[in-house]
């Protein structure tokens, strides 16, 4: 006996798909070898029709598929626009000839069923409704007009002119005549069942001038979509159940062995395993709605059908629409973070990656709310304005070519836990999501930037400086100017890196930004931060004001108010000043050719007169003395 | 829930032939999969056959024991699932029970069925 299986009989009707899934012993070479699926002929040689090593014969050309499930120790053979000519006798198996392992399937396809003349054929979905049409003489104009089912011989009343439905058709069968028309009558069954299919007689009059009318009515059952996606990546299932249940709830449910769990409905409904990844979208007014999830698990791989229903919950006789979703384990996804905890206070660099055939895409973070359907408002973007609520705290940092984009949050609050997603305008499947989790803070930040209050005047210098502790003594330290369009990053100087890191001196690690001389357009979040070539690290946010000089104050050098606020050395504000011009810097190297061109330059943009000296103050005094 | 109820067992001679049904209620708009499975005295319940279908479509699945002998069908008006046995043999003595799914991962786990009837007995006397 063979250790392969699978479904020894498949019969089906021309134009219809099959999907036969062969099952095969869970051994590393079983999962690595050839799978085919062949034609046996009379001759005994089994011809290859498609085989996982790509091949396709002409005759599947477009029309077939075969992919293997290493996880599940399957193959699937997908088979569409099925035709007589596919009646006949194959193998699926394993090996690199066709005489390796293999089981026999038999598949049939017949035709569409034909009926006498004067049968007509319905073929509805489940849930859908059906009008059948009933003609009459005009002698039976008056007469008792009736609908009945064939069961074996006797044909059992579904519903009759005098107001009679039998009980399993109550509130679903209507029969009723249009306008003045004398000859014809119609009978509506609405949530059409399985069981409701079979060959339907309608009447008008009685005994041997009764007009009779056969109707075969076929109910199908929703053809599963099949869906091949791979692991953390995302599927969107489109569901268009008609107009009729337009205003009813919609919901998407899973099939487990026994019912279908509902995973979300738009009554607010949404199963725990897909908080954080799930958004139901009405799509327009006539029912259409999608579902989206995102990082995709293993175990979310099985059998979904969408729905409506007043209740939110699948019930019987009510439109559906089925999808079979495979989740590929061999993913060109990369494994990422799916959750990053962050403190009060504190801040957050969140790794986002994307297709690197894509660089060039539109790279978005929206945050995911949980309310009724869910939805996912982007907070920032490649050229998305940073949302209300988010400015100076949140900045999305390109890295083109890394396959790679960073989102930074700062001035974290327990407000911003919750669930997040990466997203670009490229290829959807590269979607994430992250659980951002914020605990209270218990210790002080490990970045601090003093002043605290910061206010710049005018036309004079401002230094701002940014504590580090030693564990960020390694990594290249930074400033940037806050906009809405990203943290523009500002030159820097390390000069801490010169000291040995033997001797780091925890209260003294300094990186220094300097504007000089202030002007109005310098108002604005700066962000002090750590990074490792492109890794971004811990970030914290200040906000510089800027403000006229009032009259007849004294002119004091807020970097001396500064130092003396913190009841600095006196060696040490008076290195500040000392490298007052030195803190001059510019963004663009083309302006570094003549650096007097730069001071006179009266209208240069204000990152063209910002910088960050980051060093040591212990290291500076030491140099001054 | 689905509720199953088997019928048609009873004593037969070796090489005769018996029909069993399997007739569903309840919730059965999600039921896709429906097998028969046996459970010979002293020995595990062991699956026969299922028959799973999608559409007009239908995926017949057969135990190596009783390919060629044992045929599977369903009337999908009257919720109802068939065992066509031929050529019984004493070995094939056993309760059969029918059983119910939404889903099929694999035709021949047992627990890949939610629902179970409560048996009915085939007795093949040589």
């Known amino acids: 006996q063979s250790p392969i299986f699978g479904p020894q009989d498949v019969s089906s009707i021309e134009g219809n798909s099959v999907s036969i899934t062969c099952y095969y012993p869970d051994t590393s070479v079983n999962r690595h070898t050839r799978k085919y699926w062949c034609r046996q002929g009379a001759n005994g040689y089994c011809a290859t029709l498609i085989s996982s090593n790509g091949y396709l014969s002409k005759e599947y050309s477009g029309r077939a598929s075969l992919i293997n499930f290493p996880e599940n120790s399957t193959f699937v053979i997908n088979i569409a626009h099925l035709t007589q000519e596919d009646t006949g006798s194959y193998k699926c198996g394993l090996g690199t000839t066709n005489r390796g392992l293999f089981f026999d399937v038999s598949l049939e396809v017949s035709q569409v069923p034909e009926f006498p003349n004067d049968t007509h054929v319905y073929t509805k979905d489940i849930g859908r409704t059906v009008t059948i049409e009933c003609r009459f003489k005009e002698g039976n104009a008056h007469s008792k007009k009736s609908l009945c089912k064939k069961r074996g011989e006797a044909c059992e009343v579904v519903i009759d002119s005098t107001e009679y439905v039998d009980p399993s058709y109550k509130d679903r069968a209507i029969l009723f005549m249009k306008g003045t028309s004398r000859d014809i009558f119609y009978v509506n069954i609405s949530h059409l069942i399985p069981s409701d299919a079979g060959l339907y007689v309608c009447q008008a009059g009685e005994g041997p001038s009764a007009d009779k009318n056969n109707a075969d009515l076929q109910v199908l059952e929703p053809e599963p979509e099949l869906l091949y996606k791979d692991l953390r990546s995302s599927v969107t299932f489109e569901c268009d159940l008609g107009r009729e249940v337009a205003n009813d709830a919609k919901y998407l449910c899973r099939k487990n062995k026994e019912t279908c769990d509902v995973i979300i409905n738009t009554l607010g409904k949404r199963d725990p395993a897909f908080e954080g990844r799930i958004l139901l979208t009405p799509r327009d007014d006539n029912g259409r709605f999608s579902v989206l999830i995102t990082g995709l698990r293993k175990e979310d791989a099985g059998h979904y059908q969408c729905g409506a229903h007043s209740s939110g919950l699948p019930q019987e006789g009510w439109p559906v629409q089925a999808w079979q979703l495979f989740v590929n384990e061999e993913s060109t996804i990369p494994n990422s973070r799916s959750v990053v905890k962050g403190v009060t206070g504190g801040s957050v660099a969140i790794v986002c990656p994307y297709n690197p055939k894509e660089s060039s895409s539109l790279k978005y973070w929206c945050h995911w709310e949980a309310d009724e359907n869910g939805r996912c408002p982007v907070l920032v973007g490649t050229q998305a304005l940073v949302q209300e609520g988010y400015e100076g705290r949140l900045a999305l940092f390109d890295q083109p070519g890394s396959g790679a984009y960073t989102v930074i949050l700062n001035q974290l609050t327990t407000q911003d836990s919750g669930f997040y997603w990466c997203l670009t305008d490229g290829d959807s499947r590269w979607r994430t999501t992250i659980e951002l989790q914020v605990a209270e803070a218990t210790k002080k930040p490990d970045l601090e930037v003093t002043p605290q209050n910061a206010t710049a005047v005018i036309g004079e210098t401002f230094t701002i400086s940014c504590h580090y502790p030693c564990k960020f003594y390694s990594q290249e330290k930074y400033w940037c100017k806050w906009s809405n369009d990203g943290c523009h990053i500002l030159p820097s100087h390390d000069e801490g890196a010169r000291q040995s890191s033997v001797s780091c001196d925890q209260s003294s690690q300094i990186v220094s930004m300097t504007l000089n001389p202030v002007k109005k357009e310098d108002e604005g979040w700066y962000w002090c931060g750590v990074k490792e070539g492109q890794v971004y690290g811990e970030t914290t946010a200040i906000y510089v004001a800027v403000e006229e000089r009032t009259r007849g104050s004294p002119h004091i050098n807020p970097t001396d108010a500064n130092a003396r606020a913190k009841d600095a050395p006196e060696e040490e504000a008076m290195e500040s000043s000392v490298r007052e011009d030195e803190n001059k810097a510019n963004l663009d190297p083309r302006l570094f050719a003549d650096e007097r061109e730069i001071q006179n330059a009266g209208d240069q943009a204000q990152e063209n007169r910002a910088s960050g000296n980051a060093g040591s103050a212990g290291g500076q005094s030491g140099s001054s003395k | 829930e689905v509720q199953l109820v088997e019928s048609g067992g009873g004593l037969v001679q070796a090489g005769d032939s018996l029909r069993l049904s399997c007739a569903a209620s309840?919730?059965?708009?999600?039921?896709?999969?429906m097998g028969w499975f046996r459970q010979a005295p002293g020995k595990e319940r062991e699956f026969v056959a299922t028959i799973a279908w999608s559409g007009s479509t239908n995926y017949k699945y057969y135990a190596d024991s009783v390919k060629g002998r044992f045929t599977i069908s369903r009337d999908n008006a009257k919720n109802t699932v068939y065992l066509r046995m031929n050529s019984l043999k004493p070995e094939d003595t056993a309760v059969y029970y029918c059983a119910a799914s939404t889903v099929l991962t694999d035709p021949r786990r047992l627990n890949e069925y939610a629902n179970w009837g409560q048996g009915t007995l085939v007795t093949v006397s040589s």
């Open positions: 309840g919730r059965t708009f999600t039921t896709y999969v």
